[in-house]
Structures are given as structure tokens and as C-alpha cells.
Interface confidence: medium
């Protein structure tokens, strides 16, 4: 969680002198309660906007908007504390609107906005606006909170933001999987335009249970420039047990911008549909056994055996 450093946030508007200050999230009115406190915000809304930095980066930001209730308590309103809590880390960031003049009723409802909290893809936040001073210990609450879910990098509008591009969002590997003869699986995907290694992970499951019965990891060395955007092929030798047939394939890149934290792309291959006449599998076959990690891995795979399944994934 952080604040945009440009442009400087503004809270002043016609009829109100105001400045935005960093806050410790612990307003003085908690420690020194006041007798008269303002009512709570009205119609708190949070939207996802996008902000360009001076360096040309594009970041998703939480656009916070609220209005004041039309009661006499605005005469005691000294400002507002805006708090954003990232739910999975409990990290909190606050700013304070400090009113430098008294509010007066005017012909339209007072409305405030703030768009400087930078948010992360696929994260959930709790946004709270507290009117200041905060209420006395047994007083009515004068804050409003809303949860806010930021789309992940798969989303078209998030895809072009700097944090998403840094994690490889623009790379579309277009993974295809072919089931070959002789217990083999060929995985093919498109390389990105960076000389960086990849890892292809295969994990197999039985159709009826969700425990893994086989797994293999294959490394692909960093491609040369002439191989950028070309297809890479990896062939896996599968478990010899026919029931270990539900395959989950992941391609993990190691781009320089995200290293071990790059977005992974995955595809699943379901077990083939079997007719009712199939011989039931022996009970012993249910014991998960690990196969030797064999099979070849390279860019060009001339093994052109007929495939029985084709699975595509974006």
C-alpha cells in the first residue's frame, strides 16, 4: 500500500480551505474525546481509477468519494480520516483531510474525493472514512466502511497497468497439450520476447480423488533472440497407471521484472471418457506411486505421433 506522489492531492474546494496530511491512523480525538462530534459520511463509494506517474507508469488507484449529511453537525466537522486496510496483510495506510475553515451549508451537498491510494491487482481492501473529531467512547459511530475488490491481471483493463505488466500479464503462452501414444504428453507454448528460463510443471491425479499420483518438473533454458515468440515443446512420459490420467500443466516464466513471482498459466487435461465395458481397475492401483522422472525437453520436438486430445488455453 502506498500513496501516489504526483500530482499532490487536493481537498480544498469552493467555500472550504483544506489540506491533505499523512496520518498515523490514530487521530488525536481518540485520546482527547470531544463533546460535540459530526455525523457519519453518506454514500461512500469506491471505484477503480487509473493514474499515470511522471515516469509514465500506469497504476490502479482507489477512487474514494463520499458526501456529507445535511444536518447541523457539519458545523463541528474538522476534517476526515481516510483509511485503507489490505485484508490479506493487515497493512493499513491513512491520510487526513484537515479543514482550515468552517463548513457552511450551501445550495448543494458537500462532496469529497480522494484518488491517491495505489492498490494491487487481485487484492481486497477495506476502505473507511472517519469524520473528525471521532466520537466519544459510547457515541454513535461517525464512519462508513466499504470492502473493495481489485480485479486481477487477467482483466483487460488491469492487464496494461505497470504492476501487471511487470508480472508478465502481456505474455499469452497459448498453451496446447496433446496426448500422444506410449503414455506421453506433449506441451507446447509460445515463448515471450525475453531471454529468460521457463519451468513446465506437470501434476497428475486420479479421476476420482484429488491426491496427486505423479508429478514432473521440466526446465526450459532461456531462448535466444531468434526464438522469441516461437513455440517451445516439452514431452512428458506419464505414469504407467491408466487411472492416473487427470493432468494439470503449468508454465512458469522467470521474467526479469518478476523473477519467481511471475504469473503462471495453466491448463488441465481431463481423463478420457471410458465406456461401461472397461475392466475395473485393481485396488492396488489406487496407491499413489511416483514414476521415475524421465522424458525429453527441448524447443523443437519432431515426435509427430498422432494425438488423441487437443486442449487449448489462453
Amino acid at each position: 500500500l502506498r500513496l501516489l506522489d504526483f500530482p499532490a492531492p487536493v481537498c480544498a474546494q469552493e467555500g472550504l480551505s483544506c489540506r491533505v496530511k499523512n496520518s498515523t491512523c490514530l487521530d488525536d480525538s481518540w485520546i482527547h474525546p470531544r463533546n460535540l462530534t459530526p455525523s457519519s459520511p453518506k454514500d461512500l463509494q469506491i471505484q477503480l481509477h487509473f493514474a499515470h506517474t511522471q515516469q509514465g507508469d500506469l497504476f490502479p488507484v482507489a477512487h474514494i468519494e463520499w458526501t456529507l449529511q445535511t444536518d447541523a453537525s457539519i458545523l463541528y466537522l474538522e476534517g476526515a480520516e481516510l483509511s485503507v486496510l489490505q485484508l490479506n496483510t493487515n497493512e493499513r495506510l491513512c491520510v487526513r483531510f484537515e479543514f482550515l475553515s468552517k463548513l457552511r451549508h450551501h445550495h448543494r451537498r458537500w462532496r469529497f474525493t480522494f484518488s491517491h491510494f495505489v492498490v494491487d491487482p487481485d487484492q481486497e481492501y477495506e476502505v473507511t472514512v472517519h469524520h473528525l473529531p471521532k466520537p466519544i467512547p459510547d457515541g454513535d459511530p461517525n464512519h462508513q466502511s466499504k470492502n473493495f475488490l481489485v480485479p486481477d491481471c487477467e482483466h483487460a483493463r488491469m492487464k496494461v497497468t505497470t504492476p501487471c505488466m511487470s508480472s508478465g500479464s502481456l505474455w499469452d503462452p497459448n498453451i496446447t497439450v496433446e496426448t500422444l501414444e506410449a503414455h506421453q504428453l506433449r506441451v507446447s507454448f509460445t515463448l515471450w520476447n525475453e531471454s529468460t528460463p521457463y519451468q513446465v510443471l506437470l501434476e497428475s491425479f486420479s479421476d476420482s480423488e484429488n491426491h496427486s499420483c505423479f508429478d514432473v518438473v521440466k526446465q526450459i533454458f532461456a531462448p535466444r533472440q531468434e526464438e522469441f515468440h516461437q513455440r517451445a515443446n516439452v514431452t512428458f512420459t506419464l505414469s504407467k497407471f491408466h487411472w492416473c490420467c487427470h493432468h494439470h500443466v503449468q508454465v512458469q516464466p522467470f521474467f526479469s521484472s518478476c523473477l519467481n513471482d511471475c504469473l503462471r498459466h495453466a491448463v488441465t487435461v481431463p481423463c478420457p471418457v471410458i465406456s461401461n465395458t472397461t475392466v475395473p481397475k485393481p485396488v492396488a492401483d489406487y496407491i499413489p506411486l511416483w514414476e521415475p522422472r524421465s522424458g525429453s525437453s527441448d524447443y523443437k520436438d519432431d515426435d509427430d505421433k498422432g494425438s488423441s486430445h487437443h486442449h487449448h488455453h489462453h
Epitope: L48, H63, S145, A156
Partner: antibody
Framework: QVQLQESGPGLVKPSETLSLTCTVS????????WNWIRQSPGKGLEWIGD???????NYNPSLKSRVTISVDTSKNQFSLKLSSVTTADTAVYYC?????????????????????????WGQGTTVTVSS | DILMTQSPSSLSASVGDRVTITCRAS??????LGWYQQKPGKAPKRLIY???SLQSGVPSRFSGSGSGTEFTLTISSLQPEDFATYYC?????????FGPGTKVDIK
Amino acid sequence: QVQLQESGPGLVKPSETLSLTCTVSGGSISNYYWNWIRQSPGKGLEWIGDIYYSGSTNYNPSLKSRVTISVDTSKNQFSLKLSSVTTADTAVYYCARDGELANYYGSGSYQFYYYYGMDVWGQGTTVTVSS
Amino acid sequence: DILMTQSPSSLSASVGDRVTITCRASQGIRNDLGWYQQKPGKAPKRLIYAASSLQSGVPSRFSGSGSGTEFTLTISSLQPEDFATYYCLQHNSNPFTFGPGTKVDIK
């Protein structure tokens, strides 16, 4: 209420550049994406590309090599340029706004995001490519 | 690109009929889908956004449902002004793509 109005020449010669402008009235161009879509005679709708008010663009890969979309926030306008046109580019060209990513108020105070899509369209302008 | 298919491509119906149009995406698009109505010589008009939310000002006889890859537009009781072509639009992945359209005409 926001309104969009396309403008530009109705006739363009093959190999030349088609230029259209969309003027936004009744609202600000800020915090929205602005799209160009076309519809060839008797055909379906094809998204050409879009521009964010800050200048970031996305183009349809099928047209990317020929398309440029730009924005002029001071005039509340955005523009389309399509180079090296052929008769296949004869179509009705629409400009459209698509909304901010916003939030749907679910149960209680919980908010889920949704993405508005194209909510406001211009009435369209016919462009014929012919010598 | 995500391919959007619509069925049927055309249908004939009478005033008062219940009409259902289906749109399928070639891959999952969550609920990032809108339904549009277009009449001859006019721009498309959005009826449904986020797969199931009714656009402000649109009659409640229009409804949308679905998520992922399969979506439905339903007109509960067809009115004379509803005879038009209907398109779905996915805006989950670039390039955004429209369905080929479903023409609803008078039986």
C-alpha cells in the same frame, strides 16, 4: 447526459487514410476509456480499439498496423486514423464510451467489481472507400 | 481472440412471446459481458451489463443471466418495439469481441 458525435469525411479513396473525430459533450472525457467500433454493410460489429483519457491505447490485432487512436482532453475529443484503406473498410463507424471499473453493491456493504462495457454510443457515421 | 457465438442467428416470434437468446464464449470471461439491441440505421443500445444487471431506463422484461462461458438474454413478453437485432459483447480480454447477432422478427 453525455453525448457523442462522430465527424469526418464520408468518402475516402483507396490507399488513403481515414480520419474521424468523436466529440464528447455533456460530460468530461476523464476517467473513461473511449472506443471506436465499426459495422460493415450487412455485417456484425467489430471493435477497432480504445484510448484511455490519459493516452494509453489498445488496438484490435487485426487492424493494429493501420490504426492510430489519439485523445485531446482540452477539446473533449478523441480521434481515429486508419491508414491504407481498401473497400473492405467501408462501414458505419461508431465511437463509444466505456465506463470506469466500478463496484456493484452486494449484500451488506460488500462490493464486487464489475466493468461497465460500452454504455454510451455516438449515432455513427458512414465512411465509403471508393475511387 | 475470444470467439463469441450466438444462437439462434434469427428467430420469428409474436408479441407476448417469451424469447431466449444464448451467447457462448470460447473461453471463460467471468461476467464481463453486455447485451445490446440494434435497430436498422441506429447505434446499438445497451440493455444488460455485467451479464445480469439491467441498464437504467431499460424495461424489466429484459433480463440476463450466466457467467463464465454461457450467457442468456431473455425477453419475458415480446413487445412490438423489441423487434431488432441483439448482440452480446465480451469486454474481458482484448480484443473485445461481439457475437454475430440474433435477428428477432415478427412471425
